[in-house]
Interface confidence: low
């Protein structure tokens, strides 16, 4: 900033703000023999003066709206006048203050929004002037909402972006905006200068009229179709209608049916296409689209649901062909024997699957009929009459029927009269000592066995007998296994084995028959057993808190940001250190102790999303064991890629000389991801110089159509230059080249004499 | 031989105020007078300047808002009036003659410390 005050004549800028009085001489330039006076031309409007010495100034105010770069010349002459030196360059760079305001281009918008509409889209632009540098913040143009009525429990319904202008629905306006309650809202839209930043900014206000239309593209409710219909089909259930006509509909089964019985023909009507069986699907829930006649989408997809009714087409079903219960000698009267559980298909807790039981017979009957009772809606068997006897009648073969409202079925049930179970188990010794175990024995592994006798009849649940763990393992780590032949009992390993939290643990067996013990006769201390199990440390790897960690940041995060942690414990407490394994990119980096992961280069969705990597947990000190867990990054899409051309357009020709304006159709892609709806390009030449041979217009959002103007075409190769625009945040601009070439034609292709069979195109338009 | 003279400054706390004058031994027509400032380990910055109309002021950045330059009792002085410092503001003020837009520096003062410290 420190430069020279004088000096000899040479090329140099001096930068000046506009609209302040002159308050500093500019520059004095020195002589050099025989040069003794100075001569200033160019762009001096009268404002820029140089004296004869050299003495370089401005005598009034600098205006930058009327001109932003003076560009001068300075020359030296002689005593004759004479041009010694120079004329060189001298550029005054006007520098801009705030001295215009900004000016809306119309005093009045008028729009339409169509209720539900995707928040944030926009659906109209207002837009101002400021005559002020744009690259400065005087010419910085800060649109607002001043006002919306009317104001509904103080909820915006339209939002404006800032800079763009761009007025679109806000969340609650989606949601809430309704034709029937209010069809127009009017806003008063501000813009000022400065970035909107500084109290000195200027401003202007305009207002906005907007119309709500209905919007008829609405999921329907939901439907309800009867299963089994004899009905001839298809059947129309239910409708969907775009908003506008022409549009192409289609159904999405997202759960990828094997048998997808739903059909919508080009009205929007939804049709079932077959009978449905509530007991193979109950419930359907499938998409509608609305599509242009390009086959995008035209907005977001309806959820339709069809719940199939049920009727009565299943018979009630028995457990099993025969049911087996016991029931011992002595048994009292009202006792349950057992419940005899049948199943219905149809639907739950309705009348088709309420089931009634009834005993229809019983053989033999002995000593008499009607020795038990089922509840009627329960299925319970009870003893009815009297005590049964063994040696009179071992068995009875009870025929139970069970019946829905309309079907009737026959259950077989088998009970067996059994001795009475007046013998407790007892075990073979009270003590099983100690056992030492390594915490890393194996799961599965039997460390004991244990054995207790019962002397009832044997093989009923009399005798059979069941080993519990009543104390000593409130972790479930252990299990015994019954020899349903022997009763011998296998302690088993259900759970790892833990030094760190039950280095020692006194367990205790209790001998249990599945059968109730007679009145009178109860479990006494030869029913348990007792054993100590002592567990031996091992030096064991850290463990990770989970299997997968997961993280979801946006592309463009900035180096060094924290992206997401892991963490681990050692089970014998030593620290642990962190490290990364296959960050094949290089993206990442770890905190050896906290295990915060962050990004150490730029991120890139489209290189692949989720990006995964090993995080290592290694123990400082110790064996240094470690173990390995996934880290799972996903990356958030930025618009960070230009559109262009979605194939190789090489070879469109027309053939010369054109008969009528002709024009050709190309598509535009981007690497960026795109919601339901796809991409939203907008399309335009690449310069200013096309506009009188060509035009381009959209088609939809991903397709545009290149016209020619007229068909006075030179015959050669033209190179048309296509902008397309994004949209995105922020909007990315890709320029591409149509190469198009004007040729003459033999049956529709292009023909070129022998020698010139270069780069022949080879698609005709 | 034409010297400038610098006062004020010293020890402030952050967020406090002090004022710095200059006066030179001489009036000059065509020059402006300024503040420049260093501050350690660092190079010598532009500060401030008063054009020699007194018409009109300029000011770096950093200081825009806070820092106030004008004209003294005499045609010759120029005071800096620095508030709501902050600690980044420390160092050595310069006060200078200088010429022309390009700032070309004519003649320097000695320099006056401002420590900006809780």
């Known amino acids: 900033q420190e430069g020279k005050f004088s000096g000899p004549l040479k090329p140099m800028t001096f930068s000046i703000y506009e609209g302040q009085e002159p308050s500093q001489i500019i520059f004095q330039f020195k002589a050099n023999p025989p040069a003794v006076t100075f001569e200033l031309t160019g762009e001096t409007d009268n404002i820029f003066v140089i004296e004869r010495e050299g003495l370089l100034y401005y005598n009034r105010a600098l205006d930058r709206e009327t001109r932003s770069t003076h560009n001068l010349q300075v020359a030296a002459l002689d005593a004759n006048g004479i041009i010694v030196e120079g004329p060189v360059p001298i550029t005054i760079k006007v520098k801009d203050i705030n001295d215009n305001r900004p000016t809306f281009l119309q005093s009045k918008y008028e729009g339409s929004v169509r209720q539900n509409s995707r928040p944030g889209k926009p659906f109209l632009y207002v837009n101002a002037t400021d005559l002020d540098d744009p690259a400065t913040p005087n010419g910085q143009l800060y649109y607002q909402i001043v006002i919306q009525l009317p104001m509904i429990n103080n909820v915006m319904y339209f939002q404006i972006n800032n800079k763009t202008g761009a007025i679109s629905l806000t969340r609650e306006g989606s949601q809430e905006l309704n034709p029937a309650k209010n069809p127009s809202y009017n806003l008063v839209i501000s813009v000022k200068d400065m970035g909107g930043q500084s109290e000195n900014s200027f401003s202007d206000t305009t207002s906005v009229d907007i119309i709500v239309t209905e919007n008829i593209w609405k999921a329907p409710k939901p439907v309800e179709m009867v299963e089994n219909s004899t009905d001839p089909h298809p059947i129309k259930i239910t409708q969907v209608r775009w908003n506008d006509p022409g549009a192409q509909y289609s159904l999405v089964d997202k759960e990828k049916l094997p048998r997808f019985p739903f059909s919508i023909d080009q009205e929007g009507d939804i049709y079932v296409t077959q009978p449905l069986d509530r007991e193979e699907k109950d419930a359907y829930v499938f998409y509608a689209v609305a599509k242009d006649e390009y086959g995008k989408p035209l907005s977001y997809p309806l959820e339709i649901h069809v719940k199939v009714k049920d009727i009565n087409d299943n018979p009630p079903t028995c457990p099993s062909p025969v049911t087996v219960f016991e029931v011992q000698e002595n048994e009292r009267l009202g006792n349950s024997i057992g419940t005899l559980t049948a199943h219905d298909r149809d639907e739950e807790n309705t009348a088709n699957s309420f089931l009634n039981y009834r005993i229809v017979e019983q053989t033999p009957k002995l000593p008499m009929d009607g020795l038990f009772l089922i509840q009627t809606y329960a299925g319970m068997l009870q003893l009815a009459k009297q005590s049964l006897k063994k040696q009179d009648t071992p068995q009875y073969n009870l025929t139970i029927e069970v019946s829905d409202k309309d079907f009737k079925t026959l259950c077989f049930v088998q009970i067996n009269v059994i001795d009475i179970n007046d013998q407790i188990p007892i075990f073979e010794k009270s003590d099983y000592g100690n056992l030492t175990l390594a915490e890393d024995t194996n799961i599965g592994s039997t460390i004991l066995t244990i054995q207790a006798t019962d002397a009832d009849e044997p093989f009923t649940g009399s005798s059979k007998i069941l080993y519990h763990i009543i104390k000593g393992d409130s972790e479930g780590r252990l299990g015994v296994d019954t020899d349903p032949h022997t009763n011998t009992g296998y302690v088993i390993i259900k759970k790892p084995l833990d030094f760190e939290t039950a280095a020692v643990s006194n367990i205790v067996f209790k001998a249990e028959n599945p059968e109730p013990l007679v009145f009178g006769v109860k479990y006494n201390a030869s029913s348990f057993a007792k054993f100590t199990l002592i567990v031996t440390d091992v030096n064991e790897a850290p463990q990770f808190s989970q299997h997968v960690f997961q993280a979801k940041v946006s592309e463009d995060v900035a180096i060094g940001t924290k992206v997401g942690n892991v963490t681990a414990k050692d089970p014998e407490g030593l620290d642990i250190s962190y490290s990364l394994r296959g960050d094949t990119r290089g993206w990442l980096k770890i905190d050896h102790v906290t295990g915060e992961i962050f990004s150490v280069a730029p991120l890139d969705r489209e290189a692949g999303s989720p990006y995964r990597v090993q995080v290592v947990a290694t123990e400082v000190g110790g064996s240094s064991l470690s173990s390995v867990s996934e880290f799972h990054l996903i990356l958030m899409d930025v618009n960070d890629n230009p559109p262009r051309l979605a194939k190789d357009y090489t070879g469109l020709f027309f053939c010369h000389p054109l008969s009528a304006p002709g024009s050709l159709i190309f598509e535009a892609t981007d690497d960026d991801q795109h919601l339901f709806r796809g991409p939203h390009f907008t399309f335009s030449l690449g310069s200013g110089s096309l506009q009188n041979d060509w035009e381009v217009s959209k088609i939809n959002g991903t397709h545009a159509r290149l016209s020619t103007r007229h068909t006075e075409f030179e015959e050669r190769e033209y190179v048309v230059l296509i902008r397309i625009n994004d949209g995105g945040r922020p909007p990315l601009e890709g320029i591409v080249s149509l190469p198009v070439t004007f040729c003459s034609c033999v049956e529709g292709s292009c023909f070129r004499p022998a020698g010139h069979q270069t780069g022949i195109p080879t698609v005709g338009m | 031989q034409v010297q400038l003279q610098e006062s004020g400054g010293g020890l402030v706390q952050p967020g406090g105020s002090t004022r710095l004058s200059c006066v030179s031994s001489?009036?000059?027509?065509?020059?402006?007078m300024g503040w420049f400032r260093q501050a350690p380990g660092k190079e010598r910055e532009f500060v401030a300047l008063?054009?020699?109309?007194?018409?009109?002021?300029e000011y770096s950045d950093f200081v825009m808002g806070r820092f106030t330059v004008s004209r003294g009792n005499t045609q010759n002085s120029v005071n800096l009036q620095m508030n709501n410092l902050k600690p980044e503001d420390t160092g050595i003020y310069y006060c200078?003659?200088?010429?022309?837009?390009?700032?070309?520096?004519?003649?320097w003062g000695q320099g006056t410390q401002v420590t900006v410290s809780s």
């Open positions: 200078a003659v200088t010429y022309g837009v390009a700032r070309s520096v004519r003649l």
């Open positions: 001489r009036t000059f027509s065509y020059y402006d």
């Open positions: 008063l054009s020699w109309r007194g018409n009109n002021a």
